[in-house]
Interface confidence: medium
């Protein structure tokens, strides 16, 4: 798995007038990372993690970065011709990654009220479009705005590419983010469902990278699809992720149920508890 | 390639005990549980229980609850299936199996014959 | 606990014919836990089907398995040489695990 620096930005207009505020959210690796708020941008470290990878010398940098590309991004929604009445919004995405190999890669999505309408790749320049008459209206829209200051698309557009690696590689430096492992907690608990029939759910916390296969099985045999039930997994906030698993079963079958949960290569099984509540920390 | 290799053929007098061994090989040792079955000449399949080697957890089937003991040794990946008090009629060809992900036999060791003969 | 029969005990067939097995049990369990194996004399028994209808890997597609609560087919829809050999149906629905007492399908 690459890794990677995301930067989404979103800023709105109403009836044609773009609002002062906007809204910058970073991911680092996925994780919710920083986030510029709507009408006052200050950077705000998303969690423990994010202060440590940042160190509390550098949320200025990242402020001013932050509030000069919600300029930009407020700049050219306000070239955006023929906009109607209402809320509108733009998004940018900005995604930079480095691979194992150190291979790069770097691209730039532009979204008008939800709607993918221009993308391009920071590193060979080209623009590619979707192929709908209104989104190619917009794009070129756009486009001829970021090419009426050559000044501007050579200094910011075409410079975001080496931006977004250089600040990438400083997080990475920071050594907090560095190809880190950090193991599931893992939680089986029990509910009454309806008569004779009990839900068990497992759930896996605190674990980084979020890539987890987490599965009920009934004798050593993994319950095919229809019978389980998964969350998505989501950050939680402290630079690592959560998920969980249920399936529904008969009361008195409970030992033949475990929950499978592999991770980075470890595994390990957990048995549906008799009480209540069964908290098992895996151990590699 | 995933195997399980089993220990060789024994002969054992009524009332005795047989250990047989189970080395799989092929895949992580703790993900899967091993499953023991026999076969008595010409007969037909009979299970006799499973262990999850990760936790340790046995299930027996009933009728071989009081004499069968399943074990691993998770430092040498070996499943154990230990009969006592042997019969005449515990004659047969004693199989381990892998659980697998679509079914509940999908490997199979090359089998154990154990002869029980006064 | 459940007890599968398997029906004929025995199968006298010539190659190239439709081989058709039957497995009941004696009370409805579920399609995802029924499965077929193949021994042949002096060899371990052989997965063949999974959950009622899935080949197992390397399984020609002469073999397929359908079924429902309480009766389970195994269809051989062309004999060949190699297919002559004891079927096995088993449950993995509720404890203890069980198997039928066996199809031996023999040449005619």
């Known amino acids: 798995e690459p890794h990677s620096l995301r930067y989404n930005l979103t800023v709105l207009s109403w009836d044609g007038s773009v609002q002062s505020g906007f809204l910058t959210e970073v991911h680092l690796d996925g994780q919710p990372f920083l986030r510029c708020d709507r009408q006052k941008c200050r950077a705000k470290p998303q969690g423990q993690w994010a202060e440590d990878v940042l160190g509390n010398k550098t949320w200025d940098r990242e402020t001013r970065d932050l509030t000069g590309n919600g300029k930009d991004l407020r700049m050219t929604l306000a070239h955006i011709k023929d906009q109607k009445e209402g809320l509108h919004s733009l998004q940018e995405i900005r995604v930079c990654e480095i691979h194992e190999d150190n291979s790069t890669r770097s691209s730039q999505h532009f979204y008008y009220d939800g709607e993918l309408f221009l993308s391009q790749n920071l590193e060979t320049k080209e623009w590619t479009m979707p192929q709908s008459s209104r989104a190619q209206t917009l794009a070129m829209n756009v486009r001829n705005f970021l090419k009426e200051d050559a000044m501007k698309t050579k200094t910011h557009y075409h410079a975001m590419h080496a931006d977004c690696l250089q600040e990438l590689r400083r997080y990475l430096k920071s050594g907090v983010v560095l190809r880190r492992t950090v193991p599931p907690m893992v939680n089986v608990t029990r509910s009454e469902a309806s008569e004779g029939n009990i839900t068990v759910t497992c759930r896996a916390s605190g674990f980084y990278p979020w890539n987890i296969t987490l599965s009920w099985r009934q004798d050593g045999v993994s319950l095919s699809h229809d019978t389980q039930q998964w969350g998505d997994v989501l950050p939680d906030g402290n630079g690592t992720y959560q998920t969980w698993v249920a399936t529904r079963i008969c009361q008195g079958e409970e030992q033949r149920f475990t929950c499978y949960m592999e991770h980075s290569g470890n595994h390990s099984t957990h048995p549906v508890p008799s009480g209540k509540v069964l908290v098992l920390q895996s151990h590699w | 390639e995933i195997q399980l290799v089993q220990s060789g053929a024994e002969v054992k007098k009524p009332g005795a005990s047989v250990k047989v061994s189970c080395k799989p090989s092929?895949?992580?040792?703790?993900?899967?549980?091993i499953y023991w079955v026999r076969q008595a000449p010409g007969q037909g399949l009979e299970w006799i229980g499973y262990?999850?080697?990760?936790?340790?957890?046995?299930i027996y089937n009933q009728q071989f609850k009081d004499r069968a003991t399943l074990t691993v040794d998770k430092s040498t990946s070996t499943a154990y299936l230990e009969l006592s008090s042997l019969r005449s009629e515990d004659t047969a060809v004693y199989y381990c199996?892998?659980?697998?992900?679509?079914?509940?036999?999908?490997?199979w060791g090359q089998g154990t014959l154990v002869t029980v003969s006064s | 606990e459940i007890v599968l029969t398997q029906s004929p005990a025995t199968l006298s067939l010539s190659p190239g014919e439709r081989a058709t097995l039957s497995c009941s049990a004696s009370?409805?369990?579920?399609?995802?836990?029924l499965h077929w194996y193949q021994q042949k004399p002096g060899q371990s028994p052989r997965l063949l089907i999974y959950?009622?209808?899935n080949l197992a890997s390397g399984v020609p597609a002469r073999f397929s398995g359908s079924g429902s609560g309480t009766d389970y087919t195994l269809t051989i829809s062309s004999l060949e040489p190699e297919d002559f050999a004891v079927y096995y149906c088993?449950?993995?629905?509720?404890?203890?695990?069980?198997f039928g007492q066996g199809t031996k399908v023999e040449i005619k």
């Open positions: 199996s892998r659980s697998g992900e679509r079914s509940n036999f999908d490997y």
């Open positions: 092929g895949y992580a040792f703790t993900s899967n549980n």
């Open positions: 262990i999850d080697p990760y936790i340790g957890r046995i």
């Open positions: 009370s409805s369990i579920s399609s995802n836990y």
């Open positions: 959950r009622t209808s």
């Open positions: 088993q449950q993995g629905g509720s404890l203890p695990l069980t």
